[in-house]
Interface confidence: low
């Protein structure tokens, strides 16, 4: 009698390893004999597809060599024209030994940045990924983590992170190792020992010493007053990633000498700078009479303090006035790095406006001194503690160079703005307007012994110091 098809053995989930054989059985009872078709993920498997073998009148489907793309849902459908077609479905789970599909690569990274060593894996069950550094399993810590993808992420890379790494992918079927890769940590150039400033007699020898480190080891170049050193001899030695450079000079004029340490990171460079002044005793004393000329300020140190395109007085009692006055503020400016945040901007304004005085052009170019009130404001209000310390050092002879004394005005000798408002220069940075408090807040502890006029506050300038490191 005709009998509608019945699937007597429903399809089961089949686990199979890659390259192994996998078989689904779909036993059918029916009369007449049914036609059995197979689908994978609802797509018909063609009888002539050589990757499959269909036997026993279609009741056995064999995948001859399993690939990882074979996982999915397999269904058999039996139909003999009697009753409806019947279907049974089962899953093929392709089990796979771990395989590293995206292995780690050699990495060069700058200290402090984030490094990611890839390690993408395949396998079923999903492999767990661990990492080996050198010969030991890598322990995760606050900076080091194995991501879910298997990649190794290292935050804030340190020199000690450099070394050889490999990833290990493991599941119940086996273990796969990546090739060994190298993590190289590069470090920005950094100056360990800056050259020291010297005050010497004309015609003497001076050796400036500069030590720097970095990975790769930096090169050191010397700059004299903004140009490559034209005279002098340089000796260099390198030991344990530290470069030591000595510049020996025969001194015939004062100068600003800059040691520049540079190393390369790919296409970029990192640079560290340190400067020292070499001054000549007696050289810096200006002549009694004010001889000089007006010119636009073209220096660097006072850029942030002086008005844009300021006309300043350049004193011709110096052989090279621009150079000498810039050197003067540069030396004093470095001293200001350690003063309080309240004092520093005020002192910088006073220093720059005192050394590069405003200039009144005319038949006889005349420097316009700072108004006494502003000088006293710096001395007694903003920098009282620091000023005392400096005067004490001066009295004890700790400042050997007269350059320091030149850069600090004697407030009592300056003209008052109440005598002739046009005869002295104001420091807009020190003005404090209660309606527009852009600059310094008033002192609350005690009333200053100086009246700062309530002039409109100037915000034309910001006090900023160039960073030590620059990427070029």
């Amino acid at each position: 009698l005709p009998k509608a098809p019945v699937i007597t053995t429903p399809l089961e989930t089949v686990d199979a390893l890659v390259e192994e054989v996998a078989t689904f059985m779909c036993a059918v009872e029916s009369y007449p004999q049914p036609e059995i078709s197979w689908t994978r993920n609802k797509i018909l498997i063609k009888l002539f597809d050589t990757r499959y073998s269909i036997r026993e009148n279609g009741q056995l489907l064999t995948i001859l060599s399993v690939e990882d793309s074979d996982d999915g849902i397999y269904c058999c459908t039996a139909n003999n024209g009697v009753g409806g077609a019947v279907e049974s479905c089962g899953a093929l789970q392709v089990k796979m030994k771990p395989k590293i599909t995206r292995p780690p690569i050699n990495v060069k990274i700058i200290e402090g940045l984030k490094a990611v060593l890839p390690c993408t894996t395949m396998g079923n069950p999903k492999p767990s990924v661990s990492w080996i550094k050198g010969d030991s399993p890598l322990r995760e810590n606050s900076r080091t983590a194995v991501l879910e993808s298997g990649s190794l992420r290292i935050h804030n890379v340190q020199k000690e992170d450099a070394g050889q790494y490999r990833c290990v992918a493991k599941n119940s079927l086996g273990t796969a190792y990546s090739k060994v890769v190298k993590l190289e940590v590069e470090v920005f150039a950094r100056i360990l020992r800056a050259p020291e400033s010297h005050n010497v007699t004309f015609g003497s020898f001076v050796t400036l010493h500069c030590t720097a480190t970095g990975i790769p080891v930096p090169t050191i170049t010397w700059i004299e007053n903004g140009n490559a050193v034209s005279s002098g001899s340089i000796q260099e030695s390198v030991k344990d990633r530290v470069i030591d450079s000595r510049l020996q000079l025969f001194i015939t004029k004062p100068g600003l000498y800059t040691c520049i340490a540079t190393n390369k990171h790919g296409e970029k460079f990192s640079t560290a700078k340190a400067a020292a002044t070499v001054s000549i005793a007696e050289w810096s004393k200006p002549q009694k009479d004010n001889k000089g000329y007006c010119a636009q300020y073209r220096g660097e140190v006072c850029n942030a303090v002086l008005a844009k395109d300021a006309l300043v007085f350049l004193n011709t009692s110096y052989a090279d006035p621009e150079e000498a006055q810039e050197l003067l503020v540069h030396t004093a400016w470095n001293e200001l790095k350690v003063v309080s945040p309240l004092c520093r901007p005020a002192a910088e304004a006073l220093l720059c406006n005192h050394v590069f005085q405003e200039c009144s052009p005319g038949v006889v170019p005349t420097p316009i001194p700072i108004c006494r009130e502003y000088c006293l404001a710096v001395k007694e209000l903003f920098c009282a503690k620091e000023w005392l310390a400096m005067e004490e050092k001066t009295h004890r002879g700790l400042y050997r160079s007269e350059m320091h004394l030149l850069s600090v005005p004697e407030c009592s000798k300056l003209p008052s703005m109440h005598w002739d408002p046009t005869a002295c220069a104001r420091l807009p940075h020190l003005d404090y307007n209660k309606e527009n408090p852009k600059t310094f807040p008033p002192m609350t502890s005690s009333k200053p012994s100086v009246d700062i006029p309530n002039l409109p506050s100037s915000s034309s300038s910001s006090f900023s110091v160039s960073p030590t490191y620059s990427m070029t």
Epitope: T13, D71, I73, C89, A91, Q93, P125
Partner: antibody, heavy 121, light 112 residues
Framework: ELQLVESGGGLVQPGGSLRLSCAAS????????MSWVRQAPGKGLEWVSA????????YYKESVKGRFTISRDNAKKTLYLQMNSLKSEDTAVYYC??????????????WGQGTLVTVSS | QTVVTQEPSLSVSPGGTVTLTCGLS?????????PDWYQQTPGQAPRALIY???SRHSGVPSRFSGSTSGNKAALTITGAQPEDEADYYC????????????FGGGTKLTVL
């Protein structure tokens, strides 16, 4: 940000029906298997049903077979659980959970906040 | 019917180490059961901690580790923190049938 948001829970009488939905966002929905897991008040977790990435097959806990139907609409990034012939023992918070791989097999690596189903007369 | 067993409750001092286990009422747990561990704090959805015996999910602190020892799966918390106080569930695949994913009864961990 990966998110799974269940809805459709509520109070239903024994023998009644409910359809739970789970809206997915923040990941490629049609790349992952999905599951429903429930938790009766004060009790532990209980796996209910699973479906692979393509919806080509469905799996159920023995006690819900024939009553519950899991399905998915990949275009709408939504997972469903149609619950018929509900019994008082089906009372639970129902969580929608994402599998760590394409097939219905794999750890449940992301969960929704759950929707409460109360079966009571 | 085989049941997945866990300790009903355990306690640990802050900074201490505790091991939660996951067994079968008959037979041994092996890596072929792909033990998974989940954490659930009161009023919250569960959170995946460990999958396939010993692999940590992303964002899970390294103090959580998984293993199989003897005939059980184990979750070890080294240097327990107050925020680790929660219910912990293990889940196993029973046999090769992917339809059969079974949770244990859960362990209530108290950090004293």
């Amino acid at each position: 940000e990966l998110q799974l948001v269940e809805s459709g829970g509520g109070l239903v009488q024994p023998g009644g029906s409910l359809r739970l939905s789970c809206a997915a966002s923040g990941f490629t929905f049609d790349d992952y298997g999905m599951s429903w897991v429930r938790q009766a008040p004060g009790k532990g977790l209980e796996w209910v049903s699973a479906i692979p990435w393509n919806g080509g097959s469905t799996y159920y806990k023995e006690s819900v077979k024939g009553r519950f139907t899991i399905s998915r609409d990949n275009a709408k990034k939504t997972l469903y659980l149609q619950m018929n012939s509900l019994k008082s023992e089906d009372t639970a918070v129902y969580y929608c959970a994402k599998r760590s791989g394409r097939i219905a097999f794999g750890a449940l690596d992301a969960w929704g906040q759950g929707t409460l189903v109360t079966v009571s007369s | 019917q085989t049941v997945v067993t866990q300790e009903p409750s355990l306690s640990v001092s802050p900074g201490g180490t505790v091991t939660l286990t996951c067994g079968l009422s008959s037979g041994s747990v092996t890596s072929s059961n792909y033990p998974d561990w989940y954490q659930q704090t009161p009023g919250q959805a569960p959170r995946a901690l460990i999958y396939s015996t010993n692999s940590r999910h992303s964002g899970v602190p390294s103090r959580f580790s998984g293993s199989t020892s003897g005939n059980k799966a184990a979750l070890t918390i080294t240097g327990a923190q107050p925020e680790d106080e929660a219910d912990y569930y293990c889940a196993l695949y029973m046999g090769s049938d992917i339809r059969n994913y079974v949770f244990g009864g859960g362990t209530k961990l108290t950090v004293l």
